[in-house]
Interface confidence: medium
């Protein structure tokens, strides 16, 4: 039998024997930012590497007495979840470690930022494989270490880091807060969201997934053979570390948006009890547990797209809210959604050379969210078409006019303050895909893109009663790039994708009533890329 | 006592090697910002990561920071080089008072800065 | 099906030496820690040393530190313990064994044989 | 160094009999501590692991409980096959060593 942490990571075809999944993670290097780690133990002996790097504030109280066991205690352990030979998830990979953590487990913003240069330096002078640096730390949120974190992540290496055992918004910590590091949160072996003590896994729009991290058996500095069970985000975080190292040892070329949208991908979806988070979190936090891909080979066919939320806008009545993807993504459609239900939709809008997605809230308003589907598609052209509100009966209507674009996502903004329940709702014409379809008194916004063999189509589900949730999904081989609601009335909170699945949320039915206008579709716009297809077939 | 003796010679080289008081003015428009870490027990004041603008070069980093320490010592205040920065961020971590960060932000190239906190192993 | 067989032992003088093979199979040599155990006639289980076959790391209990040594050839899936300067009391069953991983903690999972090695004029 | 002292040395019993064989360690070994089953002229065999965890294949009669530094091997009922010396073995942290007890004979009454 294996630990249950490994069995959760570990896809069926690879369960049959023991643990022991093809490469192993060799071609990789992971660099462990931690306390000090007994090097010796047979986990982690040979596998890796103690710098000379040591950046440590000194132990609080006069009394304490630092016994190297418990120095190396935290620093061992995620070594041995990495990389170790029996309970380690990339045994082949090897390691480096750095000092930053003291012997109560304690560092600094600065000397985090001397190690990660110390890495980016080391880098320089020796380049080698794919590089994993491991963050398993945690400080209040800080400028400099996310500044820091997303250089080093531009240069190509994957950061992987704990989302924090505060049970809060990750977003309040770093480098947990850093778009670029890949964020980890915790789950037990029931799939719920780890408690630790009175606190727990931090959760929010900043957590990119989960892995287990409650109760995992791993290498203890008590002896070189000794064994301790350990919980928290960290060993969470030394998972999907393991795990990145095994898919990078696979494809050494993936960058880290490949890298990040096939840990999504392959994740396993909606098994978290939603019900630990605080609701105004549960919409925003990802329920992703990290597994290993089933095969090493072949993914590269699909295409990838996730869901990234924008900070709060706040109340004020003109505030906005701009979600991101990362540079090597194309933002392919935009929404919006406010818990109040008032808000003034969402517009794509360049911003320094890259499309954005900006939400606007609407007077009286709690604040909207702006909602990015950021998706990898090479040799991408992608445009905005924009038709200004038509005030004619038939509403506002764009399509994608040039020649070889297609649809793959629809927004729509308004300046006036309520776009009114008593409108008659607007239909969509049939049988024209490629057009986006809104209110009258809105600006309809098309994201029309070209790609090699890219092909998109609407899928629609409209349900007549009012209904607090309408949901339209993908099928298998296709990908969701656009969500959004038809028509674009108040009622409407907005709409987001939850992987293949467009939601779109509207007011409680109890104040809304059954009227016709109550009536409310979710439209899904479904791509694929055969050219990717094709070339993976091309390679196999 | 070393430490301290340390400090002294650092700080006479740094009044030695700048022009006294010629503080270029910082760029117009931009004004340098100061961050410290929104949860009070896990400050460390004292300690602060000055962050100069992106294209700053080592050798205007170290350049900073000598000026930096030389227009403290005008006013009475000792600090401390930590560490200079570069391969990642240009800048400079400073052990000093917090009284000089007024100073410190209309130094030129400065970005912003921050001070020090502490992180925790989770 | 995992398997360990000894070889190598025998009658040897006093003050003489031997080295004794243990043959692998049935899995990955490399990846589990080699012990060498010896019992005396009638008598308890003794435990020698291990080796760690992936770095070829050993360790000895004091007793026989500067007396055996353990090898490996891990082209040959093959562990061996070469003693020195024997003595009658050297007499014993000596024992190759795996040490397993079982959830969080190690045990000789699997024994060879043994070989039995007579120290005698 | 740790000591691992077995007792009884050694036990008659009959078959059906409940038997209880205790090792205690000198120091603390946590809950390192395995159990081996020799007959003669055989090599040992694992039975339990981890103080408690039985060893697939091991016949659920034979149980391990303990920790730190008492330790207990119970056979529920013994049968014909169990007739052998049982073996308790700990790991030494200081020495980085293996250390077995003296064994516990189990013979037929």
């Known amino acids: 039998s294996i630990p249950w942490n490994l069995e959760r990571i570990t896809p069926p075809r690879y369960r049959a024997d023991e643990y022991q999944p093809p490469d192993g993670g060799s071609l990789v290097e992971v660099y462990l930012l931690d306390t000090s780690i007994q090097s010796d133990h047979r986990e982690i002996e040979g596998r890796v590497m103690v710098t000379d790097f040591e950046n440590v504030p000194e132990e609080d109280g006069t009394r304490f007495h630092r016994q190297a066991s418990k120095c190396d205690s935290h620093g061992t352990h995620l070594a041995g979840v990495v990389s170790g030979r029996d309970a380690g998830v990339a045994k082949g990979a090897s390691m480096r470690s750095l000092r930053v953590l003291n012997c109560q487990g304690k560092g600094t913003v600065s000397g985090t930022l001397i190690g990660l240069e110390f890495i980016r330096k080391s880098q320089l002078v020796q380049p080698v494989g794919p590089l994993v640096v491991l963050l398993p730390l945690a400080g209040g949120y800080s400028r400099v270490l996310n500044a820091a974190c997303q250089r080093l992540a531009r240069a190509g290496v994957v950061l992987v880091t704990a989302a924090g055992n505060f049970r809060d918004d990750a977003c309040l910590y770093s480098p947990a807060s850093a778009p670029e590091v890949i964020t980890v949160g915790a789950t037990n072996a029931q799939d719920q969201p780890v408690t630790l003590g009175t606190l727990g896994t931090n959760f929010g729009r900043c957590v990119d997934l989960f892995a287990p991290g409650e109760d995992i058996i791993g290498a203890s500095s008590d002896c070189s053979t000794c064994f301790v069970s350990q919980s928290g985000t960290s060993q969470a975080a030394a998972h999907v570390a393991g795990i990145a190292a095994m898919m990078l040892s696979a494809e050494p070329e993936l960058t880290l948006a490949e890298l990040r949208q096939r840990l999504i991908h392959f994740s396993a979806k909606d098994v978290i009890n939603e019900a630990w988070f605080p609701e105004d979190q549960r919409v925003l936090t990802p329920n992703l547990v990290a597994a290993l891909p089933p095969s090493t080979h072949g993914a590269g066919w699909q295409l990838f797209c996730r869901t990234v939320w924008s900070a709060h806008s706040g109340p004020t009545r003109m505030a906005t809210a701009v979600a991101r993807c990362a540079p090597d993504e194309e933002l392919l459609s935009c929404s919006s959604f406010s818990r109040s239900g008032k808000r003034r939709g969402e517009r794509m809008e360049a911003q320094g050379g890259k499309l954005v997605c900006r939400a606007h809230n609407a007077f009286g308003g709690e604040g909207v969210y702006a909602i990015a589907r950021c998706c990898l598609l090479p040799q991408a052209n992608c445009s905005v078409h924009t038709a200004p509100p038509a005030e004619a009966s038939m509403g506002t209507r764009v399509h994608c006019h040039q020649q070889g674009h297609v649809l793959t996502g629809c927004s729509s903004h308004w300046e006036v303050e309520d776009l009114g329940t008593h409108k008659p709702p607007v239909l969509r014409p049939r049988g024209q895909p490629n057009q986006c379809v809104g209110h009258r008194e809105a600006s309809i916004h098309a994201s029309c893109c070209h790609a090699p063999g890219l092909e998109c189509k609407v899928k629609e589900h409209g349900i007549p009663a009012p209904q607090e949730q309408v949901t339209v999904a993908c099928e298998e081989g296709w990908t969701l790039t656009g969500c959004s609601a038809l028509p674009g009335t108040s009622h409407v909170l907005g709409a987001y994708a939850v992987d293949n699945t467009c939601v779109v949320r509207s007011r409680d039915v109890s104040t809304t009533g059954s009227t016709s206008e109550g009536a409310v579709t979710a439209v899904a716009i479904c791509c694929r890329s055969r050219h990717l297809a094709q070339a993976s077939q091309e390679l196999q | 006592q070393e430490d301290e003796d340390g400090d002294y010679e650092e700080l006479v080289l740094a009044l030695r090697s700048e022009e006294d008081g010629l503080a270029e003015a910082p760029e117009h428009g931009t004004t340098a910002t100061f961050h410290r870490c929104a949860k009070d027990p896990w400050r460390l004041p004292g300690t602060y990561v000055v962050v100069l603008k992106e294209e700053t070069h080592l050798s205007q980093s170290e350049r900073t920071a000598r000026r930096l320490q030389a227009q403290a010592a005008r006013r009475g205040y000792l600090t401390k080089i930590l560490h200079v920065f570069h391969g990642l961020l240009p800048g400079f971590l400073v052990k000093m008072s917090g009284d000089l960060l007024e100073l410190a932000l209309k130094l030129p190239h400065v970005d912003y800065i921050e001070e020090d906190s502490s992180v925790f192993a989770q | 099906e995992v398997q360990l067989l000894e070889s190598g032992g025998g009658l040897v003088q006093p003050g003489g030496s031997l080295r004794l093979s243990c043959k692998a199979s049935?899995?990955?040599?490399?990846?589990?820690?080699m012990h060498w155990v010896r019992q005396a006639p009638g008598k308890g289980l003794e435990w020698i040393g291990r080796?760690?076959?992936?770095?070829?790391?050993?360790k000895y209990n004091e007793k026989f530190k500067g007396k055996a040594t353990i090898s490996r050839d891990n082209s040959k899936n093959t562990l061996y313990l070469q003693m020195n300067s024997l003595r009658a009391e050297d007499t014993a069953v000596y024992y190759c064994?795996?040490?397993?991983?079982?959830?969080?903690?190690?045990?000789?999972?699997?024994w060879g044989q043994g070989t039995l090695v007579t120290v005698s004029s | 160094d740790i000591q691992m002292t077995q007792s009884p040395s050694s036990l008659s019993a009959s078959v059906g009999d409940r038997v209880t064989i205790t090792c205690r360690a000198s120091?603390?070994?946590?809950?390192?501590l395995t159990w081996y089953q020799q007959k003669p002229g055989k090599a040992p065999k694992l039975l339990i692991y981890?103080?408690?965890s039985l060893q697939s294949g091991v016949p659920s009669r034979f149980s391990g409980s303990g920790s730190g530094t008492d330790f207990t091997l119970t056979i529920s009922s013994l049968q014909p096959e169990d007739f052998a010396t049982y073996y308790c073995?700990?790991?030494?942290?200081?020495?980085?060593?293996?250390?077995f007890g003296g064994g516990t004979k189990v013979e037929i009454k």
């Open positions: 064994a795996r040490y397993g991983y079982y959830l969080g903690s190690y045990a000789m999972d699997y």
């Open positions: 049935g899995y990955t040599f490399s990846s589990y820690w």
């Open positions: 080796i760690d076959p992936y770095t070829g790391g050993t």
């Open positions: 120091q603390d070994v946590s809950r390192y």
């Open positions: 981890a103080a408690s």
């Open positions: 073995q700990a790991y030494d942290y200081s020495l980085s060593g293996y250390v």
